[in-house]
């Protein structure tokens, strides 16, 4: 079939002198290439049979070749054991000896590799990690194994890839293949949807207190998906947190301490592969004043027959901006003294002798007076006058 006709013309003179043109046709066959030359760059694909755990080598040639001792059907060499070399002698009638000796370097079994999602759950909202794992041993030279990933427009030549700084709640597709001596023998694809991201920050509209024991906060929710809110309010070192329904946009805080600065923090969260908290929005207010609590541990002691020393301890709750102690001294229903000090320490002199007095001590915070602490105490008779009279007799 590769032979071709080569026609040559010759001219001779006959005895009569007339020219006779005779044409001779010679069949020639050009020299065939050697099979070694013809199939020098032959490529092979390996197909794996999961049942038999054997490979088939598919020879990438245009014509049906013969394989010497190894039988090959439709250019396929069957029943090849993983990690074993097989020698195939390739010939065809279009080429001459020597045959092409093809060494089939059979790859490891496909099921010995597993494409594993190695993404840490904490980072799964913006990160993908994929890794080929060797889940069984094999005898092939691992140096001859190469890995390739293609994720969108990105190509990696690694056994493991990590993609950070992705978008949350987004599908990404990665195709991967493993090559043995540059022959692909397995591939896998994964579509990974990144996890829900941290919700955004709520936008606080207002945050204020218009009473001594109450406060109010209103807000707009964040744009991204979330499940609920956490509202924390901190006074000094005490912190209380509440879980609030996702549909709320206002919360009334009750049972607050008067004249106290409260720092509020509000964040949305989502429970995904892990709980992700959004950034917290912060605000603060100071509750209004209220009457202070009662002074305590009040004592009235005599310093002389008609002098008293009144002391008390500060109220537990001042509930206002200022600090002032008041003492009212009554005899009967008549107010006889009204004093105000920075400290609860009053020296009351020149009272009537032998008189019952009512001492009322209370705290005033600049806005409100507290409940008075009331004690009754009597002055003594004038001991000096009595003594002088006795001496006179």
């Amino acid at each position: 079939s590769d032979a071709y006709l080569n026609a040559s013309e010759t001219t001779t003179l006959s005895p009569s002198g007339s020219a006779v043109i005779s044409t001779t046709t010679i069949a020639t066959t050009p020299s065939k290439p050697t099979c070694d030359e013809k199939y020098a760059n032959i490529t092979v694909d390996y197909l794996y049979n999961k049942e038999t755990k054997l490979f088939t080598a598919k020879l990438n040639v245009n014509e049906n070749v013969e394989c010497g001792n190894n039988t090959c059907t439709n250019n396929e060499v069957h029943n090849l054991t993983e990690c074993k070399n097989a020698s195939v002698s390739i010939s065809h009638n279009s080429c001459t000896a020597p045959d092409k000796t093809l060494i089939l370097d059979v790859p490891p079994g496909v099921e010995k590799f597993q494409l594993h999602d190695c993404t840490q759950v904490e980072k799964a909202d913006t990160t993908i990690c994929l890794k080929w794992k060797n889940i069984e041993t094999f005898t092939c030279d691992t140096q001859n194994i190469t890995y390739r990933f293609q994720c969108g427009n990105m190509i990696f030549d690694n056994k493991e890839i990590k993609l950070e700084n992705l978008e949350p709640e987004h599908e990404y597709k990665c195709d991967s293949e493993i090559l043995y001596n540059n022959h692909k023998f397995t591939n896998a694809s994964k579509i990974i949807k990144t996890d829900f991201g941290s919700p955004g920050e709520p936008q606080i509209i207002f945050c204020r207190s218009e009473a001594a024991h109450q406060g109010v906060i209103t807000w707009n929710p964040p744009q991204r998906s979330f499940h609920n809110f956490t509202l924390c309010y901190i006074k000094e070192t005490e912190k209380d947190c509440l879980n609030l329904d996702k549909n709320l946009i206002k919360y009334d805080l009750q049972n607050l301490k008067p004249y106290t600065k409260y720092v509020l923090s509000l964040h949305a969260y989502i429970i995904a592969k892990v709980q992700r908290n959004g950034s917290a929005a912060m605000c603060h207010f100071t509750t209004k004043s209220a009457p202070p609590s009662q002074v305590w541990n009040m004592t009235v002691s005599m310093t002389s027959d008609n002098s008293m020393h009144v002391k008390c301890r500060p109220p537990r709750d001042r509930n206002g901006p200022h600090e002032r102690y008041h003492l009212e001294v009554e005899a009967g229903n008549t107010l006889v003294r009204n004093e105000s000090h920075k400290n609860c320490d009053f020296r009351v002199k020149d009272l009537q002798y032998s008189t019952d007095y009512t001492f009322k001590a209370y705290f005033h915070n600049g806005d409100y007076p507290g409940e008075p602490f009331i004690l009754h105490h009597s002055t003594s008779y004038n001991s000096k006058a009595h003594h002088h009279h006795h001496h006179h007799h």
Epitope: G152, K162, L163, E164, L166, Y172
Partner: nanobody, 128 residues
Framework: QVQLQESGGGLVRPGGSLRLSCAAS????????MGWFRQAPGKEREFVAA????????YYADSVKGRFTISRDNAKNTAYLQMNSLKPEDTAVYYC?????????????????????WGQGTLVTVSS
């Protein structure tokens, strides 16, 4: 708002090395992927290398694979590009870039114009 300032460019012979630095200020540095792009005279700006916010993931253009290494020091708010075995075709202005979703943009092959924050650039000339 992130500000970026490149340094380390200069003239180098073929086969030589250079290390570019990119200092960042403003924003939380570790939440941004950092990238290097370059623009040769008369050509479009092209991607060179990228590194994720934690430094765990890196990605390179085929033309620089095996020669260039991108790294970052989050404590110093700085990204680096170590360039070895430099070739005349590496001559360009090198730009540092910060983007919170850079690998998303690389996945989709989004044009560099769509990326967020850019430095002013530093010139690298490879010539004998």
């Amino acid at each position: 708002q992130v500000q970026l300032q490149e340094s380390g460019g200069g003239l180098v012979r073929p086969g030589g090395s250079l290390r570019l630095s990119c200092a960042a200020s403003g924003g939380t540095f570790s939440s941004y992927a950092m990238g290097w792009f370059r623009q040769a005279p008369g050509k479009e700006r092209e991607f060179v290398a990228a590194i994720g916010g934690s430094g765990d993931s890196t990605y390179y253009a085929d033309s620089v694979k095996g020669r260039f290494t991108i790294s970052r020091d989050n404590a110093k708010n700085t990204a680096y590009l170590q360039m070895n075995s430099l070739k005349p075709e590496d001559t360009a202005v090198y730009y540092c870039q910060a983007d919170p979703t850079m690998f998303h943009k690389l996945y989709y092959g989004i044009h560099p114009n769509e990326y967020e924050y850019w430095g002013q650039g530093t010139l690298v000339t490879v010539s004998s």
